[in-house]
C-alpha cells in the first residue's frame, strides 16, 4: 500500500530510452499519443513530472516488516494526464484523471544501473514499461537477469 497520499519528492525530467531515443507526447484528436523517436539536433525534449511515493511491500511478500519500503512513481507529461498501464492490451496510455490516481498509474521504481531506471506495473508485478516498435508497451520480464534488458531501461535527465 502507498504509505502517504502526498509524494515524498517530485522530479521534472526528460525520459529517453537506453539507446537515447526520446519519449515524446503529442495531442492528437483530443487525446495524447506517446512516441519513441530520434529528435533533431536542437529539438526540445518533452518533460515528465515524476512523483515519488513510499510504499510498503505486501506483508506476505517480504520479511522486512516496517523496513520493507519501495518507491512508487507516477509519470505526468502534462497537467491532469498520467501514464497508465493497460494490462489487457499490454499498452501504455495517457489518461486524464483526478486524484486519488488509480493503481494503474503507479509503477515500482527500479534502477539496475546508477543512471538508468525501470518502471514495473503496480497492478501486474513482473511487467514493465518497455519499448516495442517505436512505442511504449508493457513487457513481461520473467527473471531478475532480464531486468537489464535494454528495452525496459530508461534514462532520466534534466536537459
Amino acid at each position: 500500500s502507498i504509505t502517504g497520499i502526498s509524494p515524498i519528492t517530485e522530479y521534472l525530467a526528460s525520459l529517453s530510452t537506453y539507446n537515447d531515443q526520446s519519449i515524446t507526447f503529442a495531442l492528437e484528436d483530443e487525446s495524447y499519443e506517446i512516441y519513441v523517436e530520434d529528435l533533431k539536433k536542437d529539438e526540445k525534449k518533452d518533460k515528465v513530472l515524476l512523483s515519488y511515493y513510499e510504499s510498503q511491500h505486501p506483508s506476505n511478500e517480504s520479511g522486512d516488516g516496517v523496513d520493507g519500503k519501495m518507491l512508487m512513481v507516477t509519470l505526468s507529461p502534462t497537467k491532469d494526464f498520467w501514464l497508465h498501464a493497460n494490462n489487457k492490451e499490454h499498452s501504455v496510455e495517457l489518461h486524464k484523471c483526478e486524484k486519488p490516481l488509480p493503481d494503474q498509474a503507479f509503477f515500482v521504481l527500479h534502477n539496475m544501473h546508477s543512471n538508468c531506471v525501470s518502471f514495473e506495473c503496480k497492478t501486474d508485478p513482473g511487467v514493465f514499461i518497455g519499448v516495442k516498435d517505436n512505442h511504449l508497451a508493457l513487457i513481461k520480464v520473467d527473471s531478475s537477469e532480464n531486468l537489464c534488458t535494454e528495452n525496459i531501461l530508461f534514462k532520466l535527465s534534466e536537459t
Epitope: S62, D64, N111, S144, L147
Partner: antibody, heavy 121, light 106 residues
C-alpha cells in the same frame, strides 16, 4: 530487526590483500542494493562501492577501481569487498550499508558497526 | 563528478538554539539528498532522505529543506544528545558525501 555485521578487517602490509564480509539479516537481502563506505581515522565518510540487488552492476570510487571488487551471495545474505594492492591511504573503518528502498540506489537506511582496516608496514 | 560542500565545519550553539547546517552541491541534484548523523564511536544514522523526509524514529526537531544545489538541515531546538557530526550525501549522480559539520554545545 535489520542487522549488518562486518568481518575481515585487520592489520595488513601495503600491497597485500584483504577480504571483508558483511552478513545481513532481518530483511529480504536480494531486494536491496548494498554498499561499502569507509572512514579514515578522524576524517569524513567516503563512499567506496555499490552493488545492485541481483549483483549484475557494480560501481567504484575512482581511487579503488581495479583494486577492489564488490560481490554478493544472495543465497547466503552476504556482501563482500575484496581489496587488493592495498595502500596506506586505504586505512579506514569500512562500513557495510543497505539501501533504503527495494530495487533502488537511494539512501543508506542501515549501517553495520564497521570493521577497521589498517595498512601499514 | 558532483562535489558536496558543507558549512560551517564546526558549529557551536547553546541548548535550545535553532541550528542551521548548509550543504551545497556543484550541480543540481534534484532533491536526491540525505542527512546522516554520526556520534563519536558510532556508525552513521540516516536522519533525512530525499531532502525533507524524516526517517522513522528521528525526533521532529530535525528537518530538511532545499532544492537545486542548496540544501539545509535545521535542528529547531538543540539538545545535548544532538552533539555529533552531520554529513550530507547526494545520490542523483553517483554517490558523494559532504565533508561534515561538527555540532558542539557551548
Amino acid at each position: 530487526e535489520v542487522q549488518l555485521v562486518e568481518t575481515g578487517g585487520g592489520l595488513v602490509q601495503p600491497g597485500r590483500s584483504l577480504k571483508l564480509s558483511c552478513v545481513a539479516s532481518g530483511f529480504t537481502f536480494s531486494n536491496y542494493w548494498m554498499y561499502w563506505i569507509r572512514q579514515a581515522p578522524g576524517m569524513g565518510l567516503e563512499w567506496v562501492s555499490s552493488i545492485n540487488n541481483d549483483g549484475g552492476n557494480t560501481y567504484y570510487l575512482d581511487s579503488v577501481k581495479g583494486r577492489f571488487t564488490i560481490s554478493r551471495n544472495n543465497a547466503e545474505n552476504t556482501v563482500y569487498l575484496q581489496m587488493n594492492s592495498l595502500r596506506s591511504e586505504d586505512t579506514a573503518t569500512y562500513y557495510c550499508a543497505k539501501g533504503h528502498f527495494s530495487y533502488t540506489s537511494y539512501s543508506f537506511a542501515y549501517w553495520g558497526q564497521g570493521t577497521l582496516v589498517t595498512v601499514s608496514s | 563528478d558532483i562535489q558536496m560542500t558543507q558549512s560551517p565545519s564546526v558549529l557551536s550553539a547553546s541548548v535550545g538554539d535553532r541550528v542551521t547546517l548548509s550543504c551545497k552541491a556543484s550541480h543540481n541534484i534534484n532533491k536526491h539528498l540525505d542527512w546522516y548523523q554520526q556520534k563519536v564511536g558510532e556508525a552513521p544514522k540516516l536522519l533525512i532522505y530525499f531532502t525533507n523526509n524524516l526517517q522513522t524514529g528521528i525526533p521532529s526537531r530535525f528537518s530538511g529543506s532545499g532544492s537545486g544545489t542548496d540544501y539545509t538541515l535545521t535542528i529547531s531546538s538543540l539538545q545535548p544528545e544532538d552533539v555529533a557530526t552531520y554529513f550530507c550525501f547526494q545520490y542523483n549522480s553517483g554517490w558523494t558525501f559532504g565533508q561534515g559539520t561538527k555540532v558542539e554545545i557551548k
